[in-house]
Amino acid sequence: MSKGEELFTGVVPILVELDGDVNGHKFSVSGEGEGDATYGKLTLKFICTTGKLPVPWPTLVTTFSYGVQCFSRYPDHMKQHDFFKSAMPEGYVQERTIFFKDDGNYKTRAEVKFEGDTLVNRIELKGIDFKEDGNILGHKLEYNYNSHNVYIMADKQKNGIKVNFKIRHNIEDGSVQLADHYQQNTPIGDGPVLLPDNHYLSTQSALSKDPNEKRDHMVLLEFVTAAGITHGMDELYK
C-alpha cells in the first residue's frame, strides 16, 4: 500500500471549486460530497453560485468527478498502478483539453489535494470557439450520462500519467455530441509516485436533481473501477 493510499481507507469529504469562462460567459460552481474508494463511489452535489450555468451540466462532469480519480476502486492485483492515490496528500495537477466535435473546446487546470482531512479539487476552466446556437451554448444536451472507459498510461518524463478518452453526450434530437479528452497529471509533491502500466477506468455516472433545491444545480452519483490488467501467472496458479 502506498502512503497516499492509506488516506482512502474510509469515507472522505470532498470539496470542488470551479471558476469558468466560456466564450466570455463567466461562472462559478461549488461542489460538496463524499468519496469512498473502497467501492469507487462518489456522491456530490454541485451548485452554480453565480446564477444560471451558461453550459449544460453534463459537459462539466469529467472536470468535476473525473477530476478526483483518486476515489477509483483499484482491485488488489492493480493497486501498484494507482498513480492518483500515491500522489496524496500533496496531490496532483490535472490539465485537460476537451474538444467538442464541430464546436469549441474547454481547457482546464486543476489542483487536487488534501486540505486537512478533506480532498479538494480547485479548477479553472476556459472555453473558446463555441457556437452560440450549438449543442453546448444552445443547451441541447440531455440531462444524463453514459458509461465510459478512461485510458491511462505512464508519462515517465514528467513523473506522471497521460489519459485519453472520448465522451458521448446524448443530444435531445437523438444524436450524439462527442467530446475528446486529452489529460495530463503531474504530482505536486516530490515524493515517489506509482507509474502505472497501461490500463483503464470503467465509469458509471447518474445525474439527478434535488427537488428542494432552487439554485441551478446537479446531483451526481458515480462508480469508478480500474481494469485492464490481468492477474500475474503466480496468481493464476495459487
Epitope: V11, P13, L15, S30, E32, E34, T43, K45, I47, T118
Partner: nanobody, 121 residues
Framework: QVQLVESGGGLVQAGAALRLSCAAS????????MGWFRQAPGKEREFVVS????????AYADSVKGRFTISRDNAKNTAYLQMNSLKPEDTAVYYC???????????????WGQGTQVTVS
C-alpha cells in the same frame, strides 16, 4: 446526497420554549457544519445559528443570543435548536442547513431542509 428533515415546530405563546430537531441522512453527518436559518413572512431568509463538525464551535445571530442554543448528536445524525423565551418576532419558517464549508453568517450552505413553521402569539 445529504437530506435534512426538520421537526418540532408549532404554535406557542410568547415566553414559551420549543425544541427543533434536524435529522440528516445520505451522508456522513460528522463531516458537516450544521445550522439554522429562518424566514419570516415577506422577509429574506436570515442566519440564526451554526455549529461546527465537532460541536466545539458555535455562532449566533445577535437577535437570539442568550435565548437559543444549538447542539448536535453525531451518533444520532441529528442537530437540535433549543429556543427559550420565544417572542412574536421569532415567528418564521425555520430551515436546517448543512455544509462542508464553514459558511459563517454571510455564506450560503450547500444543503437545506424543507423547513418547519414556528408561530409565537
Amino acid at each position: 446526497q445529504v437530506q435534512l428533515v426538520e421537526s418540532g415546530g408549532g404554535l406557542v405563546q410568547a415566553g414559551a420554549a420549543l425544541r427543533l430537531s434536524c435529522a440528516a441522512s445520505g451522508g456522513t453527518f460528522s463531516f458537516y457544519n450544521m445550522g439554522w436559518f429562518r424566514q419570516a413572512p415577506g422577509k429574506e431568509r436570515e442566519f440564526v445559528v451554526s455549529i461546527s463538525r465537532s460541536g466545539g464551535g458555535t455562532a449566533y445571530a445577535d437577535s437570539v443570543k442568550g435565548r437559543f442554543t444549538i447542539s448536535r448528536d453525531n451518533a444520532k445524525n441529528t442537530a437540535y435548536l433549543q429556543m427559550n423565551s420565544l417572542k412574536p418576532e421569532d415567528t418564521a419558517v425555520y430551515y436546517c442547513a448543512a455544509g462542508l464549508r464553514d459558511w459563517g453568517r454571510e455564506g450560503e450552505p450547500h444543503y437545506w431542509g424543507q423547513g418547519t413553521q414556528v408561530t409565537v402569539s
